[in-house]
Structure formats: structure tokens, C-alpha cells
Amino acid sequence: LIIGFGISGRHSITVTTVASAGNIGEDGILSCTFEPDIKLSDIVIQWLKEGVLGLVHEFKEGKDELSEQDEMFRGRTAVFADQVIVGNASLRLKNVQLTDAGTYKCYIITSKGKGNANLEYKTGAFSMPEVNVDYNASSETLRCEAPRWFPQPTVVWASQVDQGANFSEVSNTSFELNSENVTMKVVSVLYNVTINNTYSCMIENDIAKATGDIKVTESEIKRRSHLQLLNSKAS
């Protein structure tokens, strides 16, 4: 969480951002909030990116003002106009690109004053893993698959019964480049699986951590998946 304060002749206002991550090819949100102001026509929201000459986005007098927008963001940005009234200046970024990563500044002007805060935006690919029993294998085998990751993640297996055990000798992980030549499909196979146990396939890079659990008993198979973005720090 980053909290910024204004620094000019006018009063300063508090602006708060949250570091976040974008999943390439999908839409992302750059979070920013500020002290709401009753005089809506005075509210100006500017999004800037370090190293980019033009603006990422500008909203003033109740509408988008995109004449100064940088080419790389053309047609890809929007603020939530209905939420500006409650102090939400968050930016929606469509079709996130790898090159969108960097330091952004959320700069706010209201009738009460000015303020800004920076935001670190990471980009990559992350997806939920699915763990299945591989019935084609000669022994009891689990197969963990996740369709899109970047940068290349690490894959670690764990089990509820053998807590702390190292499964690297009885597992095999491969990374297959997807058709867009950036993201990769992750496939990890775990051998010599015992029944009545819960196994977890944990996939992690510097952007996200995802876990796929599978519980195999004689009567049923239960699955659960969970994905968590890392470094969501507010400022």
C-alpha cells in the first residue's frame, strides 16, 4: 500500500495505491483511491507511467480527456466514472501486455488540493492448476496441469501424510511454450502415489502462487484449486 500526499500551494490530499499484477492477454486493474470531493467537475485524474512520454489516461470534467494519451495505451484504458464520486480513481487496463509492467503514478486534483502515489505493476501469466489421476500410467500417478504461466515457475509437490517430504525424485515437470511464444503450459507428474492421502501441486513465480489439491480415496476424488497474487502491497 502506498499513500501519497500532495505538495503544492493548495492543500494536500491523500492518494492511496496498491501494487498489483496483470495477467497478459487479460484485463487488469491499477488500484488508486483518494479523498472524495463534492465538487465533481474539479476532479482531475491522471495516470502516468515512468519512461512513457504521453499520459496513460486522463479524466477531467466528468469525462475522459485522451488527447495526450500515449500510443501504447490507445483504446486500452478506462476509469470507472460512477466510482469517481466515492474517491475511486482505479484504472482498467485492457489486454495487458508484458511491456505494461513498470512504475505508474496516480495523480489527483480536486477542489481541496492535489496528491499522488506510485504503484508497481508487474505483468506475467498465471493460471489455476488442475490435478487429476493419470489412469494411462503404469503406476498410481497424478498429473498437474496449468495452461498459462510466465515467467517460468517452480513446481513443488507436497502431501498431507508425508509432510516435509521431498518429491523431486518421484516427479517430473515440463514446460511447453504456448502458440503466442511467451506463456508456457506447465505439466508436472507425480509417481508412486498412495491412496487415502491429499496431494498438493504448488506452482509459483514472482507474480503468483497457485495450488491444486487432490484427495484420493477408494470411493471418491476431491479437488480444490487456489490462486494468490504476490506482492499486493498498498501505498
Partner: antibody, heavy 116, light 107 residues
């Protein structure tokens, strides 16, 4: 000095509609949101809806969805609130107010009585 | 939808004494909270916004505090004109919900 002047008291039949006006003076009308807040006899304040002329958007409380319509005429600096399918429990004082997000100026209120 | 609650429902205080009115939100509203005063037969009046900022013309005996979900309006030395109903209101999210109010009456 900002002033919000509302239309006069009304008596309405159940099932009919009401339309209350609110004329603003003393500041740029479209620079602010205008909200409607009602107060039933002996009860608290209830936010109904808000319009943001500068954004061209309106918001209603879920409770009034489909029954309330708010409009704003920038040329006359007047906001309107129409409530349809009136029932006895809509008997209240209806206030127009400048805002959100919070409300710094209020109209004098319009008493609407719904009775057969 | 955020639910606002206020306590007590009625507060009896003597003139010159201090009064503390409580407001609670069902989830965090950050600093997006306002207080209003309403006297019988009159429209409400904005007292405080942004938890602690007094509106224009509001005397400094009115003070707001708190953050997140718990808020307090303190009136340091009650004057006869301070009696009436007090409402808190959140503006973190649409819809703009008011609390049920606290009636401040003369003891």
C-alpha cells in the same frame, strides 16, 4: 449563497405517480451531484437516488429500482425526481440535496402524502 | 450493501456536558463518513465529512473521530441548540447509506 428550492406539498392516490422538482441557484449546477433523500414520519433518512449531470449518470438505491426516475435540466438548473406506483408507505418528506458523496446543501423538503 | 448502526438510539445529556455518539459500519468505509444534525421540522445540516473535517460554519465543539468501521461524534460542551437527531452516513460505496440516527435530548 447556494439554494435548493423544491416544489410544494402534494397529496397522491395509491398507484399514482409523483414528480418533485428542485431548482438550484448560487453555484454551477452541473459541477455537483444531486441526490434525493426521503424521511417518513418519525423515521430516519433514506437515500433514494442520485444524478451526476457532469458525468451524465444516475444511481438508484436497489429498493427503488424500477420505480424512481431522476433527471436534470442543466439549462434551468433543475433536478426532478419521479416515483411511480405509490403506496401509503411512500408518505414522507422528500429532500433534494447537493451531493454525494456527502450532502452539504439541502432543499426545504416536499411533503408527499399517499392516501386513498 | 453497507449497513450502518448508531448507538445509543436516545441520549439524555445536560447542557454544558459532553456527549459521545457512536456509529458503526458493517465493513470498512475508510474515512468516507459524514455526520448530520437535524432539528424537528427542519432539513438536515452537514456537520462533518471525511470523519473529522468540520463543514463550513460548524463550531469547534463538534469533533469527529475513528476510521474503518468505528466512528464517534463528540460534542464537547452541549448548547441548547445542539439538541436534535444526529445521523452518520457512509460514502465509500453506492448506495449512500445513513445510520438510523441518535436522538440527543435534554436531561
Amino acid at each position: 449563497q447556494v439554494q435548493l428550492v423544491q416544489s410544494g406539498a402534494e397529496v397522491k392516490k395509491p398507484g399514482s405517480s409523483m414528480k418533485v422538482s428542485c431548482k438550484a441557484s448560487g453555484d454551477t449546477f452541473s459541477s455537483y451531484a444531486i441526490s434525493w433523500v426521503r424521511q417518513a414520519p418519525g423515521q430516519g433518512l433514506e437515500w433514494m437516488a442520485g444524478i451526476i449531470p457532469v458525468f451524465g449518470t444516475a444511481h438508484n438505491a436497489q429498493k427503488f429500482q424500477g420505480r424512481v426516475t431522476i433527471t436534470a435540466d442543466k439549462s434551468t438548473s433543475t433536478a426532478y425526481m419521479e416515483l411511480s406506483s405509490l403506496r401509503s408507505e411512500d408518505t414522507a418528506v422528500y429532500y433534494c440535496t447537493r451531493g454525494g458523496p456527502y450532502f452539504d446543501y439541502w432543499g426545504q423538503g416536499t411533503l408527499v402524502t399517499v392516501s386513498s | 450493501e453497507i449497513v450502518m448502526t448508531q448507538s445509543p438510539a436516545t441520549l439524555s445529556v445536560s447542557p454544558g456536558e459532553r456527549a459521545a455518539l457512536s456509529c458503526r459500519a458493517s465493513q470498512s468505509v475508510s474515512s468516507n463518513l459524514a455526520w448530520y444534525q437535524q432539528k424537528p421540522g427542519q432539513a438536515p445540516r452537514l456537520l462533518i465529512y471525511g470523519v473529522s473535517t468540520r463543514a463550513t460554519g460548524i463550531p469547534d465543539r463538534f469533533n469527529g473521530s475513528g476510521s474503518g468501521t468505528e466512528f464517534t461524534l463528540t460534542i464537547s460542551s452541549l448548547q441548547s441548540e445542539d439538541f436534535g437527531a444526529y445521523y452518520c452516513q457512509q460514502y465509500k460505496k453506492w448506495p449512500f447509506i445513513f445510520g438510523p440516527g441518535t436522538k440527543l435530548e435534554i436531561k
